[in-house]
């Protein structure tokens, strides 16, 4: 990659491992924990970041926890399987060999199981709603401001192309932000609403996974927008699969 | 290999409307984003609006909206760049260029069409 | 809008020389920056994307470079089938996607 080819680090991952061993001395870059090569131009996978942060020593993580008000991701952070193109494979399993089936953002949908546990097909998640709660401010954001500046943010930082941006909403102090992608819109080199959804995540927390790159910083028209809370909702191509038990 | 093949040379009166179309073979249609870009005579290049097959979405350069409408079919892996309300600086070349999601690069483009018009 | 500015606007080099063609952002675009070549009459070509990266089949003698908002297109050794136009395009911002000017590069 080009960024910051002198000192050979990735712009987008700060959880890599770069060396100028790639073709013509090209600085190449490998994600911590699964040692696959990533593309430094686009956000890298939610699978292999989470792999990266499972596989940070537990005294060097610059990590924090999630915060109380965050829905944390199927049950918390676990270290995941990730196929040869860092996607989440459908069936997870931890080191007890209890197993239980994702969806493409790493959330599971179903029971935990045993090994003899079958998850046929990842299931894509195809909408994803982030639903923020801003501090309060002198007065309300006006919302195309909001809009624009939200979809400039996405595709900017996160390279999303605002057509995946469906809807903006406002109802002071909530922002909910829709994220639409059916596998058949995706067109090379555009960037999955699940990658985009996790690296938004990370840095409302202040958890940002860029390298070099400074914290967020959202401003509507010169005003600051701080999030105070944030909740993720995913909706699945096919609903998930859970027994009536766990819904009660 | 890759080939976008546009359509002919058109000479249009003012106020006409012209319809290019570009066929595009040798990659799968409706995986990467259509562009279309023109070049007025001895001018830059002007970026003028993208399309997704896939889906038919599509967005336009503000100085077109109104005037341009991009359309596709998928059963010919046809992309079309239809221009209203011509005028005499809208005599250019107009090309359809692949482009890349992400570093929205243009890889192949079209051989151009002319589009000349005179009253 | 994002503008792009390219110079020189026009170069006359020769066979052999290393050229240097710059591209000025108006606003940050990390890396998101591509560069064409352009011969009379026919369509552009993809040279460079993304700074640095070559484009499939184009000769390692064109090189790239810069972050922010200077951006270098670099010929080491100029063959006579370089002589062309170059653009710059920035494909970083929400649409439209702007070029650069051109630079027209002539035999000296």
């Known amino acids: 990659h080009t960024a910051a080819q002198d000192n050979c680090t990735c712009p987008t991952n700060k959880m890599t491992v770069c060396s100028p061993d790639g073709p013509g001395g090209r600085c190449q870059c490998r994600a911590l924990g699964s040692g696959m090569a990533v593309d430094c131009s686009t956000l890298t996978s939610k699978c292999l970041l989470l792999k990266a942060r499972m596989s940070a020593p537990k005294n060097a993580r610059t990590l924090v926890r999630p915060s109380e008000h965050a829905l944390v991701d199927n049950d918390g952070l676990y270290d995941p399987d990730c196929d040869p193109e860092g996607r989440f494979k459908a069936r997870q399993c931890n080191q007890t060999s209890v197993c239980w089936c994702v969806n493409s953002v790493g959330v599971r949908r179903t029971d935990k199981g045993d090994l003899s546990l079958r998850c046929d097909e990842l299931v894509r998640t195809h909408h994803i709603l982030i639903d923020l709660r801003h501090r309060p401010t002198a007065g309300a954001f006006n919302h195309s401001d909001l809009d624009a500046e939200l979809r400039r943010l996405f595709r900017e930082r996160y390279r999303l192309h605002p057509k995946f941006v469906a809807a903006v909403h406002y109802e002071q102090p909530t922002i909910q932000i829709e994220l639409r992608q059916n596998t058949s819109q995706k067109a090379a080199g555009d960037v999955d609403i699940g990658d985009a959804a996790y690296y938004f995540e990370r840095d409302i927390k202040g958890e940002s996974l860029f390298q070099g790159r400074g914290g967020l910083d959202l401003r509507v028209r010169g005003e600051p927008l701080q999030v105070e809370r944030t909740l993720i909702y995913y909706l699945d191509e096919i609903p998930p699969k859970f027994s009536m038990k766990r819904l009660t | 290999q890759v080939q976008l093949v546009q359509s002919g040379a058109e000479v249009k009166k003012p106020g006409a409307s012209v319809k290019v179309s570009c066929k595009a073979s040798?990659?799968?249609?409706?995986?990467?984003?259509m562009h279309w870009v023109r070049q007025a005579p001895g001018q830059g290049l002007e970026w003028m609006g993208e399309i997704t097959p896939s889906d038919n979405y599509t967005s336009y350069a503000q100085k077109f909206k109104g005037r341009v409408t991009i359309t596709r079919d998928t059963s010919t892996s046809t992309a079309y760049m239809e221009l209203s309300s011509l005028r005499s600086e809208d005599t250019a070349v107009y090309y359809c260029a692949r482009g890349h999601g992400n570093y929205v690069s243009f890889d192949y483009w079209g051989q151009g069409t002319l589009v000349t018009v005179s009253s | 809008d994002i503008q792009m500015t390219q110079s020189p606007s026009s170069l006359s080099a020769s066979v052999g020389d290393r050229v240097t063609i710059t591209c000025r952002a108006s606003?940050?675009?990390?890396?998101?920056l591509n560069w064409y070549q352009q011969k009379p009459g026919k369509a552009p070509k993809l040279l460079i994307y993304?700074?640095?990266r070559l484009h499939s089949g184009v000769p390692s003698r064109f090189s790239g470079s810069g972050s922010g908002t200077d951006f270098t297109l670099t010929i080491s050794s100029l063959q006579p089938e370089d002589f062309a136009t170059y653009f710059c395009?920035?494909?970083?911002?929400?649409?439209?996607?702007?070029f650069g000017q051109g630079t027209k590069l002539e035999i000296k």
């Open positions: 395009q920035q494909g970083y911002s929400l649409p439209p996607y702007t």
């Open positions: 993304y700074t640095s």
């Open positions: 040798g990659y799968t249609f409706t995986s990467y984003w």
């Open positions: 606003q940050d675009i990390s890396n998101y």
